[in-house]
Interface confidence: low
């Protein structure tokens, strides 16, 4: 997957820091205050649609297969600009009692950026 | 995630069912001959942006989070009707070599969409 | 310490809607789920749906589907379900509930509304 | 949908006995599952939550295990205030949420 630079307007993985405090999730996260979660933006032309990087899925291969030909419904199918890559990190938090947990939660961090 | 049932015109799972000889695969793809593809369609208005059915993230909670609250640049950021949870099929192919592979293949099914 | 007060009993004809409110007070922040769930006379607990009031983030059970709207608003600290084509079998007591963390980790109902009871009769 | 399907549906003790409550779920929930009381007229309560963790202000003899399809509630020695109706509810990562349909704990 792309890293934005500036430079292109296609789909790539941009730089993001979340501050937990922001969000009004420090009463309840405990460490870290904040990370980089990053996000995904950018234009998705048709010749680049169901191209995710290294995550480049089976299914949107297979969907592109018939977008490119032009195949209804997909012709009008918007490709989008998504996370294709998503990983854990490991947070210290109150549960839903007053227990400290230290777990890795799914999904916080967007390695890559893809056109789906 | 929600089901397309022709009434509702918010992301939803549409079924689809891929024949692999109308995209030329039949050539490598020794069995299934087809498969229950599915695709996702539908507006992702923003009182629903970040809603991924039982996939919703701790990223797109996070992101969401800016955008409701029209944080740049995630206000113009567009929520796509994505494909929130693949499964994997089992399939029987010719590998590089003319090998018969029986190999289960990641993300080949859309089980639930989302908005991103 | 967190209250969640529900507006009163209601009595309704079928094919009409009910809006019920749940006013949240004391440690709020718009980022908890709050969630209604609704219990019929003699019966069991059954999840409607929830909503976040930070994003207006609402997201409902299936079987509700088209017929429930869970709303909010951030500056009263309260949520409200409106529940439309009103049928006998709607006649129930509808709690809103919230969890103890914000979302997406805190999951259970620990604060619950006293209940609204809600009678759908011609 | 997972379906939660609570056994007895009644269960008639005397204080001081030992009560045990069942919950099976129809697919794998992890641990992802709480147990609350709710007596009549009142709103539930939370007694237990991810299995086996004790909610804020329960008292020790309620105690909760399992993991996967198989949830056990256990109270040690009934008390008279614990003649009341248990559910379970499960959330497995995110919703729908689903409650089970009801153990009644009734005085024999």
């Known amino acids: 997957g792309l890293e934005c630079d500036g430079k292109v307007n296609i789909c790539c993985k941009k730089q993001f820091f979340v501050s937990f405090k922001d969000i009004g999730w420090n009463d309840w996260i405990i460490a870290p205050s904040g990370y980089h979660a990053n996000y995904c933006e950018g234009e998705c032309p048709s010749h680049i649609a169901g191209t995710s990087g290294s995550s480049l899925s089976f299914h949107s291969t297979v969907i592109n297969h018939y977008r490119m030909r032009g195949h209804s419904p997909f012709a009008n199918l918007k490709s989008c600009c998504v996370p294709t890559k998503l990983r854990p990190m490991s947070m210290l938090y109150y549960d839903d009692g007053q227990n400290i947990i230290k777990k890795d939660i799914q999904n916080m961090i967007v390695e890559e950026c893809g056109c789906s | 995630g929600l089901e397309c049932d022709g009434k509702v015109n918010i992301c939803c799972k549409k079924q689809f069912f891929v024949s692999f000889k109308d995209i030329g695969w039949n050539d490598w793809i020794i069995a299934p001959s087809g498969y229950h593809a599915n695709y996702c369609e539908g507006e992702c208005p923003s009182h629903i942006a970040g809603t991924s059915g039982s996939s919703l993230s701790f990223h797109s909670t996070v992101i969401n989070h800016y955008r409701m609250r029209g944080h740049s640049p995630f206000a113009n950021l567009k929520s796509c009707c994505v494909p929130t949870k693949l499964r994997p099929m089992s399939m029987l192919y010719y590998d590089d070599g003319q090998n018969i592979i029986k190999k289960d293949i990641q993300n080949m099914i859309v089980e639930e969409c989302g908005c991103s | 310490q967190v209250q969640l007060v529900q507006s009163g009993a209601e009595v309704k004809k079928p094919g009409s809607s009910v809006k019920v409110s749940c006013k949240a007070s004391?440690?709020?922040?718009?980022?908890?789920?709050i969630s209604w769930v609704r219990q019929a006379p003699g019966q069991g607990l059954e999840w409607m749906g929830y909503?976040?009031?930070?994003?207006?983030?609402?997201n409902y059970a299936q079987k509700f589907q088209g017929r429930v709207t869970i709303t909010a608003d951030e500056s009263t600290s309260t949520a409200y379900m409106e529940l439309s084509s009103l049928r006998s079998e709607d006649t129930a007591v509808y709690y809103c509930?919230?969890?103890?963390?914000?979302?997406?980790?805190?999951?259970?109902?620990?604060?619950w509304g006293q209940g609204t009871l809600v009678t759908v009769s011609s | 949908e997972i379906v939660l399907t609570q056994s007895p549906a009644t269960l008639s003790l005397s204080p001081g006995e030992r009560a045990t409550l069942s919950c099976r779920a129809s697919?794998?929930?992890?641990?992802?599952l709480a147990w609350y009381q709710q007596k009549p007229g009142q709103a539930p309560r939370l007694l237990i939550y991810?299995?086996?963790n004790r909610a804020t202000g329960i008292p020790a003899r309620f105690s909760g295990s399992g993991s996967g399809t198989d949830f056990t509630l256990t109270i040690s020695s009934l008390e008279p205030e614990d003649f009341a109706v248990y559910y379970c509810?499960?959330?497995?990562?995110?919703?729908?949420?689903?409650f089970g349909g009801g153990t009644k704990v009734e005085i024999k």
């Open positions: 004391g440690g709020t922040s718009s980022s908890y789920a």
């Open positions: 509810q499960q959330d497995s990562i995110f919703p729908p949420y689903t």
């Open positions: 991810d299995a086996s």
């Open positions: 509930a919230r969890p103890v963390r914000t979302y997406p980790l805190g999951k259970y109902f620990y604060h």
């Open positions: 697919q794998s929930v992890s641990s992802y």
């Open positions: 909503i976040i009031p930070a994003f207006g983030t609402a």
